[in-house]
């Protein structure tokens, strides 16, 4: 089952999500995607980084974190009703079947 | 157009081995997952392996995991199936396909004509 | 693993008949459902993903609806090319299984 995070219409919403880095600056992809994770990867992608960067975003989403240090956490601006339901964070650790993902519940009030 | 050809099939005896290949053309190789599927004698669909756009991340289901191993080479636009250790049931058609997953994971988008394995002594 | 019962196995049905494929999952599997034909000697071609989005160049005449743990394809009008095996495949959870499909026979 998923946990669940709570937030207001018009306020930002958090989604935690954390990996350690296996060094400094040694990242590993992150997607984030709106609904449950599918088999690999993610499903309607709102973020993504790759072994370097942020390289894939859509408006109103962004990690507030330091994402290097493996604070992956989700912030979504300005939530409306329809932001509610579940969300994928997806951490692509490289090897065989080595994805950690999660699934986590926003309810907007 | 996209094209997906698979290569390398044949007769093999039980505990033997074989590499697929599959040449990939007509589209970027190396932003796609990439995928191995096979069909049984009695048609029936089985998920083989997926490789991630890198090939960082592999994916196998119970079945295969530890004789099987995929790998791609990004600069020749080429996927391989390494199997090993063959069974009388690994005897199937084999496909390799394309998986799309930039903005939204989707299975299988395009397929090749697919090579043929048969493992019998 | 998650088992796909897909039904009828075999279909027998004429041109211009409309005819529903159905899929139910062994466990909860959101909309991650995706739907292929097969004709005779060829490769699975796809049709659905995301249990009804169609992919690009798909008629419309095929639908696809559904989440959960229940599933169907539907060919509203069957056109003499639509005579073939059709599989669902559920991508939700490792492994990515499908189902013994649907041979569509012309009556």
């Known amino acids: 089952s998923e946990v669940e995070y709570r937030a207001e219409v018009g306020q930002n919403a958090y989604l935690p999500c954390f990996y350690t880095p296996a060094a400094p600056g040694n990242l590993v992809p992150v997607c984030w995607g709106k609904g449950a994770c599918p088999v690999f990867e993610c499903g309607n992608v709102v973020l993504r980084t790759d072994e370097r960067d942020v390289n894939y975003w859509t408006s109103r989403y962004w990690l507030n974190g330091d994402f290097r240090k493996g604070d992956v956490s989700l912030t979504i601006e300005n939530v409306t009703l329809a932001d509610s339901g579940i969300y994928c964070c997806r951490i692509q650790i490289p090897g065989i079947m080595n994805d950690e993902k999660f699934n986590l519940k926003l309810v907007i009030k | 157009q996209v094209q997906l050809q698979e290569s390398g099939g044949g007769l093999v005896k039980p505990g033997g081995s074989l590499k697929l290949s599959c040449a990939a053309s007509?589209?970027?190789?190396?932003?796609?997952?990439m995928s191995w599927v096979r069909q049984t004698p009695d048609k029936r669909l089985e998920w083989v392996a997926t490789?991630?756009?890198?090939?960082?991340?592999?994916y196998y289901p119970d079945s295969v995991k530890d004789r099987f191993t995929i790998s791609r080479d990004n600069a020749k636009n080429t996927l391989y199936l390494q199997m090993s250790s063959l069974k009388s049931e690994d005897t199937a058609m084999y496909y390799c396909a394309r998986d799309p997953y930039y903005t939204n994971y989707v299975p299988m988008d395009y397929w090749g004509q697919g090579t043929m394995v048969t493992v019998s002594s | 693993d998650i088992v796909m019962t897909q039904s009828p196995s075999f279909l027998s049905a004429s041109v211009g008949d409309r005819v529903t494929i159905t899929c139910k999952a062994s466990q909860y599997v959101d909309t991650y459902v995706a739907w292929y034909q097969q004709r005779p000697g060829k490769a699975p071609k796809p049709l659905i993903y995301s249990a009804s989005t169609r992919h690009t160049g798909v008629p419309s005449r095929f639908s696809g609806s559904g989440s959960g743990t229940e599933f169907t394809l539907t060919i509203s009008s069957l056109q003499p090319e639509d005579f073939a095996t059709y599989f669902c495949a559920q991508y939700s959870s490792s492994p990515l299984t499908f189902g013994g499909g649907t041979k569509l026979e012309l009556k």
């Open positions: 490789i991630s756009n890198s090939g960082g991340s592999t």
């Open positions: 007509g589209f970027t190789f190396s932003s796609y997952y």
